[in-house]
Protein backbone atom coordinates (compact mmCIF):
# COMPACT_ATOMS: atom_id res chain seq x y z
CA UNK A 1 0.00 0.00 0.00
CA UNK A 2 1.58 3.40 -1.01
CA UNK A 3 1.52 6.53 1.45
CA UNK A 4 -0.77 8.88 0.42
CA UNK A 5 1.55 11.72 1.59
CA UNK A 6 4.67 13.03 1.77
CA UNK A 7 6.42 12.67 5.20
CA UNK A 8 6.00 15.06 7.56
CA UNK A 9 7.99 18.18 7.09
CA UNK A 10 10.14 20.16 9.76
CA UNK A 11 11.36 23.52 9.54
CA UNK A 12 15.19 23.28 8.84
CA UNK A 13 15.46 19.72 8.27
CA UNK A 14 15.91 17.04 5.61
CA UNK A 15 14.68 13.20 5.72
CA UNK A 16 16.29 10.10 4.50
CA UNK A 17 15.60 6.15 4.38
CA UNK A 18 18.20 4.95 5.49
CA UNK A 19 16.71 1.44 3.65
CA UNK A 20 13.42 0.99 1.72
CA UNK A 21 10.64 -1.47 2.30
CA UNK A 22 9.67 -3.89 -0.77
CA UNK A 23 7.41 -2.25 -2.91
CA UNK A 24 8.47 1.36 -2.72
CA UNK A 25 8.75 2.72 -6.15
CA UNK A 26 11.84 5.40 -7.49
CA UNK A 27 10.83 7.78 -10.38
CA UNK A 28 13.20 7.41 -13.78
CA UNK A 29 13.38 10.94 -14.11
CA UNK A 30 16.38 12.44 -15.60
CA UNK A 31 17.98 16.52 -15.54
CA UNK A 32 16.90 19.28 -17.64
CA UNK A 33 18.18 18.45 -21.18
CA UNK A 34 17.96 15.13 -20.94
CA UNK A 35 14.87 12.23 -20.89
CA UNK A 36 13.94 9.07 -20.78
CA UNK A 37 14.78 6.61 -23.12
CA UNK A 38 12.26 4.05 -24.79
CA UNK A 39 14.39 1.35 -23.64
CA UNK A 40 14.72 2.35 -19.98
CA UNK A 41 12.21 2.25 -17.34
CA UNK A 42 9.99 4.17 -15.98
CA UNK A 43 10.41 3.52 -12.12
CA UNK A 44 12.86 1.09 -10.26
CA UNK A 45 10.68 -1.26 -7.86
CA UNK A 46 12.01 -2.79 -4.60
CA UNK A 47 11.52 -6.60 -4.85
CA UNK A 48 12.58 -9.62 -3.10
CA UNK A 49 11.98 -12.57 -0.61
CA UNK A 50 12.76 -13.27 2.90
CA UNK A 51 16.48 -13.52 2.05
CA UNK A 52 17.23 -10.85 -0.29
CA UNK A 53 16.03 -7.69 -1.73
CA UNK A 54 16.75 -5.41 -5.22
CA UNK A 55 15.74 -2.92 -6.95
CA UNK A 56 14.28 -3.68 -10.29
CA UNK A 57 14.60 -1.98 -13.82
CA UNK A 58 17.14 0.13 -14.95
CA UNK A 59 16.56 4.00 -15.16
CA UNK A 60 18.28 5.77 -18.27
CA UNK A 61 18.61 8.89 -19.40
CA UNK A 62 19.43 10.46 -23.02
CA UNK A 63 20.12 14.29 -24.04
CA UNK A 64 17.42 15.70 -25.73
CA UNK A 65 19.27 16.86 -28.61
CA UNK A 66 20.74 13.70 -29.78
CA UNK A 67 18.79 10.18 -30.20
CA UNK A 68 21.07 7.85 -31.00
CA UNK A 69 23.29 8.22 -27.45
CA UNK A 70 21.90 6.73 -24.28
CA UNK A 71 23.88 6.89 -21.24
CA UNK A 72 22.79 4.50 -18.58
CA UNK A 73 24.01 3.21 -15.08
CA UNK A 74 23.35 -0.39 -14.25
CA UNK A 75 22.26 -0.73 -10.75
CA UNK A 76 25.90 -2.48 -9.16
CA UNK A 77 25.18 -3.27 -5.38
CA UNK A 78 28.86 -2.41 -4.82
CA UNK A 79 28.53 0.84 -6.31
CA UNK A 80 28.16 4.07 -4.71
CA UNK A 81 29.04 7.19 -6.73
CA UNK A 82 28.81 10.90 -5.80
CA UNK A 83 25.79 12.30 -6.84
CA UNK A 84 26.81 15.89 -7.96
CA UNK A 85 23.93 18.29 -6.86
CA UNK A 86 23.88 21.45 -4.31
CA UNK A 87 21.51 20.18 -1.71
CA UNK A 88 23.28 16.79 -1.27
CA UNK A 89 25.89 16.01 1.45
CA UNK A 90 28.54 13.76 1.56
CA UNK A 91 27.69 10.07 0.14
CA UNK A 92 27.54 6.56 3.01
CA UNK A 93 28.15 3.02 1.74
CA UNK A 94 25.15 1.78 2.76
CA UNK A 95 25.18 -1.30 4.73
CA UNK A 96 24.57 -3.92 3.37
CA UNK A 97 21.12 -5.13 2.02
CA UNK A 98 21.18 -8.34 3.87
CA UNK A 99 21.48 -6.46 7.34
CA UNK A 100 17.67 -5.57 6.74
CA UNK A 101 15.37 -8.04 5.26
CA UNK A 102 12.70 -6.93 3.14
CA UNK A 103 14.36 -3.82 2.32
CA UNK A 104 16.56 -1.94 -0.58
CA UNK A 105 19.34 0.25 0.15
CA UNK A 106 19.48 3.17 -1.73
CA UNK A 107 19.68 2.52 -5.62
CA UNK A 108 22.96 3.99 -7.16
CA UNK A 109 22.86 7.51 -9.30
CA UNK A 110 22.43 6.68 -12.78
CA UNK A 111 24.08 9.32 -15.52
CA UNK A 112 22.10 12.23 -16.18
CA UNK A 113 19.68 11.81 -13.27
CA UNK A 114 17.65 14.43 -12.30
CA UNK A 115 18.69 16.60 -9.38
CA UNK A 116 15.94 15.29 -6.65
CA UNK A 117 14.69 11.65 -6.16
CA UNK A 118 11.03 10.97 -6.13
CA UNK A 119 10.35 7.98 -4.26
CA UNK A 120 6.43 6.47 -3.58
CA UNK A 121 6.63 5.26 -0.52
CA UNK A 122 4.79 1.90 1.30
CA UNK A 123 3.23 1.61 4.68
CA UNK A 124 5.67 0.63 7.03
CA UNK A 125 8.52 2.66 5.70
CA UNK A 126 10.82 4.57 8.14
CA UNK A 127 12.68 8.24 7.69
CA UNK A 128 14.51 9.39 9.57
CA UNK A 129 15.50 13.61 10.01
CA UNK A 130 18.65 15.53 10.15
CA UNK A 131 19.00 19.57 10.55
CA UNK A 132 19.65 21.37 7.63
CA UNK A 133 23.93 22.73 8.00
CA UNK A 134 23.63 25.53 10.67
CA UNK A 135 21.09 24.51 12.33
CA UNK A 136 21.42 22.61 15.71
CA UNK A 137 18.97 19.52 16.79
CA UNK A 138 16.56 19.26 19.60
CA UNK A 139 14.81 16.18 20.59
CA UNK A 140 11.97 15.78 22.12
CA UNK A 141 11.80 12.24 21.06
CA UNK A 142 12.94 10.09 17.78
CA UNK A 143 14.16 11.89 14.72
CA UNK A 144 12.11 10.03 12.82
CA UNK A 145 8.55 9.24 10.93
CA UNK A 146 6.89 6.09 10.04
CA UNK A 147 4.33 5.91 7.29
CA UNK A 148 1.40 3.35 9.09
CA UNK A 149 -2.02 2.39 8.14
CA UNK A 150 -5.07 3.39 10.53
CA UNK A 151 -8.59 3.13 9.90
CA UNK A 152 -8.19 2.22 5.93
CA UNK A 153 -5.82 5.57 5.88
CA UNK A 154 -1.97 5.95 5.37
CA UNK A 155 -0.11 8.79 7.85
CA UNK A 156 2.97 9.65 8.68
CA UNK A 157 3.76 9.92 12.48
CA UNK A 158 5.03 12.88 13.69
CA UNK A 159 8.78 13.19 14.30
CA UNK A 160 9.57 15.01 17.45
CA UNK A 161 12.73 17.28 16.08
CA UNK A 162 13.49 20.86 16.42
CA UNK A 163 16.14 22.47 14.84
CA UNK A 164 17.18 25.62 16.35
CA UNK A 165 19.88 28.00 14.22
CA UNK A 166 22.82 27.60 16.15
CA UNK A 167 25.46 27.87 14.36
CA UNK A 168 26.49 24.32 14.96
CA UNK A 169 26.15 20.88 12.61
CA UNK A 170 24.82 17.93 14.24
CA UNK A 171 25.69 14.37 13.35
CA UNK A 172 23.28 12.41 11.50
CA UNK A 173 20.86 11.03 12.88
CA UNK A 174 21.19 13.70 15.93
CA UNK A 175 24.24 14.36 18.33
CA UNK A 176 21.80 13.79 21.13
CA UNK A 177 20.07 10.39 21.96
CA UNK A 178 16.76 10.39 20.76
CA UNK A 179 14.85 10.15 24.31
CA UNK A 180 12.00 7.45 23.47
CA UNK A 181 8.91 9.08 25.59
CA UNK A 182 5.24 8.01 25.79
CA UNK A 183 4.56 11.56 24.59
CA UNK A 184 7.30 10.98 22.03
CA UNK A 185 5.22 9.16 19.74
CA UNK A 186 1.40 8.71 20.08
CA UNK A 187 0.72 4.68 19.41
CA UNK A 188 -2.41 4.23 20.63
CA UNK A 189 -3.59 3.62 17.05
CA UNK A 190 -3.72 0.53 15.56
CA UNK A 191 -0.25 0.37 12.99
CA UNK A 192 0.13 -2.00 9.88
CA UNK A 193 3.74 -3.85 8.98
CA UNK A 194 5.55 -1.92 11.16
CA UNK A 195 7.20 -4.34 13.67
CA UNK A 196 9.65 -3.80 16.68
CA UNK A 197 12.20 -5.85 14.83
CA UNK A 198 11.65 -3.04 11.49
CA UNK A 199 12.32 0.09 14.72
CA UNK A 200 15.46 -1.63 16.31
CA UNK A 201 17.26 -2.81 13.25
CA UNK A 202 17.19 0.27 11.66
CA UNK A 203 17.44 2.58 14.65
CA UNK A 204 20.98 0.68 14.97
CA UNK A 205 21.52 1.46 11.82
CA UNK A 206 20.83 4.59 12.01
CA UNK A 207 23.08 5.22 14.53
CA UNK A 208 26.03 3.69 12.99
CA UNK A 209 25.51 5.46 9.64
CA UNK A 210 27.51 8.43 8.55
CA UNK A 211 25.41 11.69 6.88
CA UNK A 212 23.56 10.16 4.01
CA UNK A 213 22.76 11.74 0.52
CA UNK A 214 19.49 14.13 1.28
CA UNK A 215 17.04 14.68 -1.33
CA UNK A 216 14.17 17.21 -0.58
CA UNK A 217 11.61 15.88 -2.63
CA UNK A 218 9.63 12.83 -2.18
CA UNK A 219 6.04 12.39 -4.17
CA UNK B 1 14.76 -1.59 -29.72
CA UNK B 2 12.73 -3.32 -27.23
CA UNK B 3 10.92 -6.19 -28.58
CA UNK B 4 8.55 -8.40 -27.07
CA UNK B 5 7.31 -11.55 -28.64
CA UNK B 6 5.38 -13.76 -27.55
CA UNK B 7 4.04 -18.04 -29.08
CA UNK B 8 2.62 -20.92 -27.47
CA UNK B 9 -1.19 -19.74 -28.28
CA UNK B 10 -3.43 -22.23 -29.43
CA UNK B 11 -6.54 -24.35 -28.98
CA UNK B 12 -6.98 -26.43 -26.11
CA UNK B 13 -8.84 -28.14 -24.21
CA UNK B 14 -10.82 -27.34 -20.62
CA UNK B 15 -9.18 -28.96 -17.99
CA UNK B 16 -5.98 -28.88 -20.61
CA UNK B 17 -2.66 -27.06 -20.17
CA UNK B 18 -0.75 -24.73 -21.83
CA UNK B 19 2.75 -22.74 -22.22
CA UNK B 20 3.44 -19.40 -23.42
CA UNK B 21 6.96 -17.87 -23.75
CA UNK B 22 7.78 -14.56 -24.25
CA UNK B 23 11.35 -13.59 -26.11
CA UNK B 24 12.73 -10.53 -25.29
CA UNK B 25 15.63 -8.22 -27.10
CA UNK B 26 16.46 -4.49 -26.93
CA UNK B 27 17.18 -4.07 -23.38
CA UNK B 28 18.74 -5.95 -20.28
CA UNK B 29 16.52 -8.46 -19.78
CA UNK B 30 17.76 -9.95 -16.63
CA UNK B 31 17.16 -6.37 -14.56
CA UNK B 32 13.63 -5.81 -15.23
CA UNK B 33 10.35 -7.28 -13.96
CA UNK B 34 7.83 -8.62 -16.40
CA UNK B 35 4.39 -9.56 -16.59
CA UNK B 36 1.64 -11.02 -18.42
CA UNK B 37 -1.92 -9.68 -19.29
CA UNK B 38 -4.06 -10.59 -20.86
CA UNK B 39 -7.29 -9.37 -23.20
CA UNK B 40 -10.50 -11.37 -24.21
CA UNK B 41 -12.16 -10.96 -27.24
CA UNK B 42 -13.74 -7.77 -27.23
CA UNK B 43 -12.98 -7.13 -23.62
CA UNK B 44 -10.84 -5.00 -21.65
CA UNK B 45 -7.73 -5.54 -20.17
CA UNK B 46 -6.63 -8.05 -17.03
CA UNK B 47 -3.19 -7.74 -15.51
CA UNK B 48 -2.56 -11.43 -14.88
CA UNK B 49 0.83 -11.56 -13.10
CA UNK B 50 4.10 -10.35 -12.43
CA UNK B 51 7.90 -11.38 -11.82
CA UNK B 52 10.60 -9.67 -10.34
CA UNK B 53 13.78 -9.75 -12.43
CA UNK B 54 15.53 -12.64 -9.85
CA UNK B 55 12.09 -14.01 -9.75
CA UNK B 56 12.27 -13.63 -5.96
CA UNK B 57 8.95 -11.30 -6.06
CA UNK B 58 6.09 -13.47 -8.01
CA UNK B 59 1.95 -11.78 -8.11
CA UNK B 60 -0.96 -13.02 -9.40
CA UNK B 61 -4.39 -12.19 -10.08
CA UNK B 62 -6.80 -13.92 -7.94
CA UNK B 63 -8.39 -15.56 -11.31
CA UNK B 64 -5.37 -17.32 -12.05
CA UNK B 65 -3.82 -17.66 -8.45
CA UNK B 66 -2.79 -21.74 -8.21
CA UNK B 67 -3.31 -22.43 -12.14
CA UNK B 68 -0.65 -20.07 -13.97
CA UNK B 69 2.80 -20.10 -13.22
CA UNK B 70 4.76 -17.22 -14.39
CA UNK B 71 9.03 -17.66 -14.29
CA UNK B 72 11.37 -16.51 -16.65
CA UNK B 73 14.89 -17.81 -17.85
CA UNK B 74 17.48 -14.52 -17.66
CA UNK B 75 20.05 -16.40 -19.52
CA UNK B 76 18.25 -17.13 -22.47
CA UNK B 77 16.19 -13.62 -22.31
CA UNK B 78 12.41 -15.60 -21.93
CA UNK B 79 9.49 -15.04 -20.05
CA UNK B 80 7.00 -17.84 -19.76
CA UNK B 81 3.46 -18.45 -18.13
CA UNK B 82 2.12 -22.34 -17.39
CA UNK B 83 -1.48 -22.52 -17.77
CA UNK B 84 -3.47 -25.18 -16.35
CA UNK B 85 -6.84 -26.43 -15.70
CA UNK B 86 -7.86 -24.35 -18.18
CA UNK B 87 -11.47 -23.10 -18.56
CA UNK B 88 -13.67 -21.22 -21.19
CA UNK B 89 -13.42 -17.85 -19.80
CA UNK B 90 -9.31 -17.66 -20.19
CA UNK B 91 -9.71 -17.64 -23.79
CA UNK B 92 -8.17 -14.58 -24.38
CA UNK B 93 -5.22 -12.73 -26.01
CA UNK B 94 -2.16 -12.73 -24.27
CA UNK B 95 0.75 -10.43 -24.33
CA UNK B 96 3.84 -9.95 -22.19
CA UNK B 97 4.85 -6.47 -21.40
CA UNK B 98 6.97 -4.56 -19.62
CA UNK B 99 6.44 -1.53 -17.33
CA UNK B 100 3.70 -0.91 -19.56
CA UNK B 101 5.63 0.94 -22.27
CA UNK B 102 6.73 -1.70 -24.12
CA UNK B 103 4.27 -4.43 -25.24
CA UNK B 104 4.63 -8.23 -27.07
CA UNK B 105 1.97 -8.83 -30.19
CA UNK B 106 0.50 -10.99 -28.45
CA UNK B 107 -0.46 -14.79 -28.54
CA UNK B 108 -3.95 -16.49 -28.56
CA UNK B 109 -5.06 -18.71 -26.50
CA UNK B 110 -8.46 -19.97 -27.33
CA UNK B 111 -10.11 -22.47 -24.40
CA UNK B 112 -12.65 -25.06 -25.98
CA UNK B 113 -14.17 -28.20 -26.53
CA UNK C 1 -7.53 -3.65 -5.43
CA UNK C 2 -7.57 -0.28 -6.83
CA UNK C 3 -10.44 0.08 -9.15
CA UNK C 4 -10.19 2.13 -11.92
CA UNK C 5 -13.39 3.90 -13.66
CA UNK C 6 -12.73 4.79 -16.86
CA UNK C 7 -15.09 7.39 -19.42
CA UNK C 8 -16.82 7.76 -21.79
CA UNK C 9 -16.57 4.01 -22.57
CA UNK C 10 -16.82 5.46 -26.06
CA UNK C 11 -16.89 8.56 -28.12
CA UNK C 12 -18.01 9.65 -31.94
CA UNK C 13 -16.16 12.50 -32.69
CA UNK C 14 -14.84 14.75 -35.99
CA UNK C 15 -11.09 15.14 -37.20
CA UNK C 16 -9.64 18.34 -35.72
CA UNK C 17 -11.47 18.11 -32.17
CA UNK C 18 -10.50 18.32 -29.21
CA UNK C 19 -11.72 15.33 -26.90
CA UNK C 20 -10.66 14.23 -23.11
CA UNK C 21 -11.02 10.74 -21.41
CA UNK C 22 -11.06 10.29 -17.42
CA UNK C 23 -9.80 7.94 -15.61
CA UNK C 24 -11.27 7.73 -11.77
CA UNK C 25 -9.27 5.08 -9.23
CA UNK C 26 -10.73 4.42 -6.13
CA UNK C 27 -7.73 5.53 -3.88
CA UNK C 28 -4.89 7.75 -4.54
CA UNK C 29 -2.27 6.43 -6.71
CA UNK C 30 -0.21 9.11 -6.88
CA UNK C 31 0.27 10.01 -10.83
CA UNK C 32 1.06 6.32 -11.32
CA UNK C 33 -0.63 5.89 -14.09
CA UNK C 34 0.16 4.88 -18.11
CA UNK C 35 -2.26 5.97 -20.83
CA UNK C 36 -2.51 3.41 -23.89
CA UNK C 37 -3.35 3.29 -27.03
CA UNK C 38 -4.73 0.08 -29.07
CA UNK C 39 -4.87 0.37 -32.66
CA UNK C 40 -7.24 -2.65 -34.06
CA UNK C 41 -5.78 -5.73 -34.33
CA UNK C 42 -2.90 -4.11 -33.04
CA UNK C 43 -0.73 -3.98 -29.73
CA UNK C 44 -0.29 -1.71 -27.33
CA UNK C 45 1.32 2.09 -27.62
CA UNK C 46 2.18 3.75 -24.34
CA UNK C 47 1.06 7.03 -24.92
CA UNK C 48 1.91 9.00 -21.25
CA UNK C 49 3.43 7.85 -18.18
CA UNK C 50 3.74 9.17 -14.60
CA UNK C 51 0.23 10.86 -15.23
CA UNK C 52 1.76 13.59 -17.62
CA UNK C 53 5.15 12.97 -19.49
CA UNK C 54 4.79 12.43 -23.05
CA UNK C 55 6.58 9.13 -24.43
CA UNK C 56 9.36 9.97 -26.81
CA UNK C 57 7.94 9.64 -29.99
CA UNK C 58 4.34 10.20 -29.36
CA UNK C 59 3.01 13.90 -31.20
CA UNK C 60 2.14 16.76 -28.76
CA UNK C 61 -1.45 16.15 -29.52
CA UNK C 62 -1.57 13.90 -26.79
CA UNK C 63 -1.16 15.06 -23.01
CA UNK C 64 -2.17 14.21 -19.73
CA UNK C 65 -3.03 15.79 -16.55
CA UNK C 66 -4.22 14.94 -13.07
CA UNK C 67 -3.88 14.15 -9.46
CA UNK C 68 -4.57 11.62 -6.43
CA UNK C 69 -7.46 9.89 -7.85
CA UNK C 70 -8.61 11.63 -11.02
CA UNK C 71 -6.32 11.45 -14.03
CA UNK C 72 -7.21 12.35 -17.99
CA UNK C 73 -5.73 11.82 -20.99
CA UNK C 74 -6.63 14.84 -23.66
CA UNK C 75 -6.10 14.82 -27.34
CA UNK C 76 -6.21 17.64 -29.34
CA UNK C 77 -7.10 18.55 -32.63
CA UNK C 78 -7.78 14.84 -33.85
CA UNK C 79 -6.41 12.69 -36.52
CA UNK C 80 -7.08 10.00 -38.60
CA UNK C 81 -4.65 8.19 -36.77
CA UNK C 82 -6.13 8.80 -33.55
CA UNK C 83 -8.93 6.63 -33.89
CA UNK C 84 -8.30 4.01 -31.26
CA UNK C 85 -9.06 2.29 -27.89
CA UNK C 86 -7.54 4.33 -25.13
CA UNK C 87 -6.68 2.22 -21.58
CA UNK C 88 -5.60 3.80 -18.83
CA UNK C 89 -3.69 1.23 -16.28
CA UNK C 90 -2.27 2.29 -12.29
CA UNK C 91 1.16 0.56 -11.34
CA UNK C 92 0.93 2.13 -7.84
CA UNK C 93 -0.07 -1.04 -6.44
CA UNK C 94 -0.45 -4.82 -6.80
CA UNK C 95 -2.49 -6.30 -8.86
CA UNK C 96 -2.14 -3.62 -11.77
CA UNK C 97 -5.82 -2.66 -13.27
CA UNK C 98 -6.60 -0.96 -16.13
CA UNK C 99 -9.52 0.91 -16.95
CA UNK C 100 -12.61 -0.58 -19.50
CA UNK C 101 -11.45 1.74 -22.47
CA UNK C 102 -12.70 4.01 -24.54
CA UNK C 103 -13.58 3.83 -28.11
CA UNK C 104 -12.91 6.42 -29.90
CA UNK C 105 -15.04 6.54 -33.52
CA UNK C 106 -15.35 8.91 -36.32
CA UNK C 107 -18.21 10.94 -36.61
Known amino acids: ELCDDDPPEIPHATFKAMAYKEGTMLNCECKRGFRRIKSGSLYMLCTGNSSHSSWDNQCQCTSSATRNTTKQVTPQPEEQKERKTTEMQSPMQPVDQASLPGHCREPPPWENEATERIYHFVVGQMVYYQCVQGYRALHRGPAESVCKMTHGKTRWTQPQLICTGEMETSQFPGEEKPQASPEGRPESETSCLVTTTDFQIQTEMAATMETSIFTTEYQ | DVQLVESGGGLVQPGGSRKLSCVAS????????MHWVRQAPEKGLEWVAYISSGSGTIYYADTVKGRFTISRDNPKNTLFLQMTSLRSEDTAMYYC??????WGQGTLVTVSA | DILMTQSPSSMSVSLGDTVSITCHAS??????IVWLQQKPGKSFRGLIYHGTKLEDGVPSRFSGSGSGADYSLTISSLESEDFADYYCVQYAQFPRTFGGGTKLEIK
Open chain 2, 97 to 102: ARDWMN
Open chain 2, 26 to 33: GFTFSTFG
Open chain 3, 27 to 32: QGIRSN
